[in-house]
Interface confidence: low
């Protein structure tokens, strides 16, 4: 599996040469260049940056660099009619209004085209009514409200704190509960780390800071008007009423200064327990409505944003493979930002830029990778992963036949504590082996490997002496490649100590304060963590593109399949009586997992022994490895989610950011005790077990000897 046998190269052109060429100072310089003005999707500034990157990638030495454009649905605030929320008295007078924009950070006071905080794709509307505080607006929060506390959100405006789950899931939950509007806010409990100053004196969120973000529930569809197909010049577009995933009620985000004003007057029920209390000096009463003296006051939303079909631009660079040019390893990350993008995405884009430069340097010295490497700068990720999804829809036939792997490259950092990796089990061994060869940037681990510091700081919950590697969820550009097309995918970045704070992001996420200075002053002054992430991402791409035998270990899939089968079985076993009544058995699934384990073991033995000098046999074995991920794809997709087609993994139906294993079975079992027709519900569980067992068995058979 060594990379040193790559084609047309002298021995110095190996992984080490590629890694040694990566420089922290260059990443720093690129980050500065990419963050001086906003690069919002669909704007002229972002088009100009696309052309700049195209030009520079050509200079770096790629064989070709093209722009791929699409016309997709985007969303913007109305420049002359701003969005805000008010408290109104019984006469309808506005006695309090929320901020119209964030106070700009020092040095940026004169920058134009900073989009004010808004929830992208919110419909227009001016609902008014009583407020209900719904905690994080998770499924379980609404269960608590409706089932335990008997609080009805129908016709109410709900206020939810950001964090824990994707904001689109919060809005969907609120809609299902009958709310007529949603206010999202950042609570200091989730976005203000104790002992750290707020920006510009530290990396915490100031009271006027606000998180932007889209509130779609696309479920992998891409452009809401052209699901399944590219939004090209001759596209047929749905009407807005038939668009995929758009919210039906107005939504708006605010900071914690404004949230304090809304929450301090709340009356009604007390919070059910301490997990509903944030860090503001307010009672966190649930409502509905304001307390005593303020009971006649209401909350009114004023939302005037518009949805517009707008042109976006991906940059696609190609470095042709010398031996297998029809096998593609893809490195992609987005370019569009909400404002300056100091972390999201430009800390990732700067790393991609330096990786392209290093590959280009090797190519100029006569080297080529064994397989083709594609580099992508995606547009409109923040508006629903639109650029990557449209490109993948346009090129799906090529990708499903030729796609070896996709490595994602959004934000390189969300902290500076340790490495974080989410990937297919096929890449576990690649990641382990690579990180054992890289130096740790962490203080106290001088001279030690990245693997060692990572394992120490983020140990695997299952395997002692190994680091945690998480499941892929969604919320980023790998989604279409992994969840729809079944291309082995992975992502890596440096993260915080996130034991207790999994999905809330870093404090300044999607705010105006996400600047170059935030990174350079507080997160990574030496850019050593960025360099490490460049080495991990770039090293994975190098090895995937250059190894004679693909660096995939199918035995690791066997291990997790057993774990996931155990987990879903134990969930089902919470209902032993129903399982008996409806004859629900997991035997077929466990049998399939057992078969997969045995076949994967035998395949791995053959992989060690076969004649690697025989190009036909080599290609055959590599194709079995490449197509294994593809074998987990169900062409019919998951129930009501046709673009989530991976049977082993899907984004959680309750949190897009999180991955769920055996999602079809999981969703069929979820809240099954509340279903009105238990026979039908358990029938669906049985059907999903059947689909999962068949898929695992079918995938196993792709690893059997071909004849």
């Amino acid at each position: 599996k060594s990379s040193n046998e790559a084609t047309n190269i002298t021995p110095k052109h190996n992984m080490k040469a590629f890694l040694d060429e990566l420089k922290a100072e260059n990443i720093k310089k690129f980050l500065y260049n990419f963050t001086q003005i906003p690069h919002l999707a669909g704007t002229e500034q972002n088009f100009q940056l696309a052309k700049q990157i195209q030009s520079q990638w050509k200079e770096f030495g790629l064989d070709s660099v093209e722009l791929a454009h699409y016309d997709v649905l985007l969303s913007y605030p109305n420049k002359t009619h701003p969005n805000y929320i008010s408290i109104i008295n019984e006469d309808g007078n506005e006695i309090f209004n929320t901020s119209l924009f964030e106070p700009p950070p020092p040095g940026y006071e004169n920058v134009s085209d900073i989009v004010p905080p808004f929830s992208a794709f919110s419909p227009q509307g001016m609902p008014e009514g009583d407020l209900v505080y719904v905690n994080y607006a998770r499924t379980e929060d609404f269960f608590k409200l409706e089932r335990d506390m008997k609080i009805n959100c129908s016709g109410k405006i709900v206020i939810a704190r950001y964090g824990k789950v994707f904001r689109g899931n919060k809005v969907k939950n609120a809609q299902l509960a009958g709310a007529k509007g949603v206010i999202l806010y950042s609570d200091p409990a989730d976005y203000f780390a104790p002992g750290v100053k707020s920006y510009p004196d530290g990396w915490n969120l100031p009271g006027g800071g606000v998180q932007r973000g889209n509130i779609l529930n696309l479920n992998g569809a891409g452009d809401p008007l052209t699901p399944g197909y590219p939004a090209n010049e001759y596209a047929y577009r749905r009407g807005i009423a038939e668009a995929v995933g758009l919210p039906s009620i107005p939504v708006h985000p605010i900071g914690y200064y404004d949230a304090q004003k809304l929450l301090e007057k709340m009356g009604g029920s007390a919070p059910p327990d301490s997990s509903w209390r944030g860090s503001l000096k307010v009672p966190y009463n649930v409502g509905p409505g304001f307390t005593g003296n303020f009971s006649t006051q209401k909350v009114k939303m004023h939302i005037h944003s518009t949805n517009e079909v707008t042109r976006i631009y991906n940059v696609i660079g190609t470095l042709r493979g010398a031996v297998e040019p029809d096998r593609y390893v893809i490195l992609g990350g987005h370019r569009d930002s909400w404002v300056f993008g100091g972390i999201d995405p430009q800390s990732g884009a700067a790393v991609v830029h330096e990786i392209v430069r290093s590959f280009g340097t090797l190519k100029k010295e006569g080297w080529r990778p064994r397989r083709t490497i594609l580099f992508a700068s995606w547009d409109a990720e923040e508006f629903g992963l639109l650029g990557s999804t449209e490109w993948a829809e346009e090129n799906s036939r090529l990708l499903q036949e030729r796609g070896v792997a996709y490595i994602n490259a959004d934000s390189s950092i969300e902290g500076n504590y340790t490495l974080r990796v989410d990937c297919t089990p096929l890449m576990y061994s690649l990641v382990h082996n690579l990180t054992k060869e890289l130096k740790s940037p962490d203080e106290g681990f001088e001279g030690k490997s990245l693997y060692e510091s990572w394992t120490k700081k983020s140990p695997s919950p299952e395997f002692s002496g190994m680091p945690r590697i998480s499941k892929l969820g969604s919320g980023n550009d790998f989604e279409v490649f992994f969840q729809r097309l079944g291309i082995a995918s992975g992502r890596a970045r440096y993260t915080k100590n996130w034991e207790t704070n999994k999905f809330s992001g870093y404090p300044l996420y999607h705010s105006v304060y996400e600047t170059y200075e935030l990174v350079e002053k507080f997160y990574d002054p030496m850019f050593k963590y960025h360099l490490t992430v460049a080495q991990v991402r770039g090293g994975m791409v190098f090895e995937l593109a250059n190894s004679i035998v693909l660096p995939f270990d199918c035995r690791d899939y066997a291990v997790v399949l057993r774990k996931y089968a155990d987990k879903i079985y134990s969930i089902s076993m919470k209902h032993p009586q129903e399982m008996k009544t409806y004859s629900v058995s997991f035997d077929s699934l466990f049998s399939a997992v057992k078969n997969f384990t045995e076949i994967a073991s035998k395949f791995s033995e053959r992989l060690q022994d076969f004649d690697k000098s025989n190009p036909i046999v080599l290609r055959m074995m590599n194709d079995q490895l490449m197509f294994l991920e593809r074998a987990f794809i169900d062409p019919l997709g998951l129930p009501d989610r046709p673009f989530y087609r991976h049977v082993i993994y899907a984004p959680s139906s309750h949190n897009k950011y999180a991955g769920e294993s055996f999602p079809g079975i999981y969703d069929a079992l979820f809240d099954i005790e509340s279903k009105v027709d238990p026979s039908k519900a358990w029938g669906e569980v049985k059907r999903q077990i059947y689909v999962a067992a068949f898929t695992v068995q079918a995938a196993a058979e792709t690893l059997s000897e071909v004849a």
Epitope: E462, S464, R562, A565, K567, S570, P576, S585, T597
Partner: antibody, heavy 120, light 107 residues
């Protein structure tokens, strides 16, 4: 208290039959896979058989298939092992155990054992 | 069938010693390995599940490690009550099998 109590052991002639019982208490019997494990005198442990929560799936060590039958009666919270065509090499202490975690990975609760002696 | 081979078959140690018991599988069993302790005339007792996961009520001096084919059970400081026979067991594929045991004796 979670408890398993085996009974039914004793002396039997080669070729004879015997039925072992295991009474479960202190947990919801029908929620768990159950297993029989045996230990010949001075020897190690051998997993004999196990059964899923409702008795629809059973698994046996290859050497015992056709001679031994594992079954359960959830109304009585009892696990059984019917042993036919017994041989001298079946002489052992037979343990009943609760199999836990997903399918039937490991045994977290054991009975005290009942001795079966096959001899003429 | 998967064979589990434990070594050594017996081991003498003094109270306070650190001891390591080994279990080797004839093929990869991932992390599907568990450890039991058995005292004479008694039923086995579960010590460690899935290589390294601790069991409630089992002292923290017992720890496990390994993955694939090679596994170890370590007793960081042997206590008088630890002198017993230790068995590993795989649940990777049916039929489930035990190792032949390692007897820990007092020196």
């Amino acid at each position: 208290e979670v408890q398993l109590v085996e009974s039914g052991g004793g002396l039997v002639q080669p070729g004879g039959s015997m039925r072992l019982s295991c009474a479960a208490s202190g947990f919801t019997f029908s929620d768990y896979y159950m297993a029989w494990v045996r230990q010949a005198p001075g020897k190690g442990l051998e997993w004999v058989a196990n059964i899923n929560y409702d008795g629809t799936s059973t698994y046996y060590a290859d050497s015992l298939k056709g001679r031994f039958t594992i079954s359960r009666d959830s109304s009585k919270n009892t696990l059984y092992l019917q042993m036919n065509s017994l041989r001298a090499e079946d002489t052992a202490v037979y343990y009943c155990a609760r199999a836990l975690d997903g399918y039937y990975g490991y045994l977290d609760v054991w009975g005290q054992g009942t001795t079966v002696t096959v001899s003429s | 069938d998967i064979q589990l081979t434990q070594s050594p078959s017996s081991l003498s140690a003094s109270v306070g010693d650190r001891v390591t018991l080994t279990c080797r599988a004839s093929q990869s069993i991932s992390n599907n390995l568990h450890w039991y302790q058995q005292k004479p005339g008694k039923a086995p007792k579960l010590l460690i599940k899935y290589v390294s996961q601790s069991i409630s009520g089992i002292p923290s001096r017992f720890s496990g490690s390994g993955l694939g084919t090679d596994f170890t059970l370590t007793i960081s400081s042997v206590q008088p009550e630890d002198f017993a026979t230790y068995y590993c067991q795989q649940s990777n594929s049916w039929p489930y099998t035990f190792g032949q045991g390692t007897k820990l004796e007092i020196k």
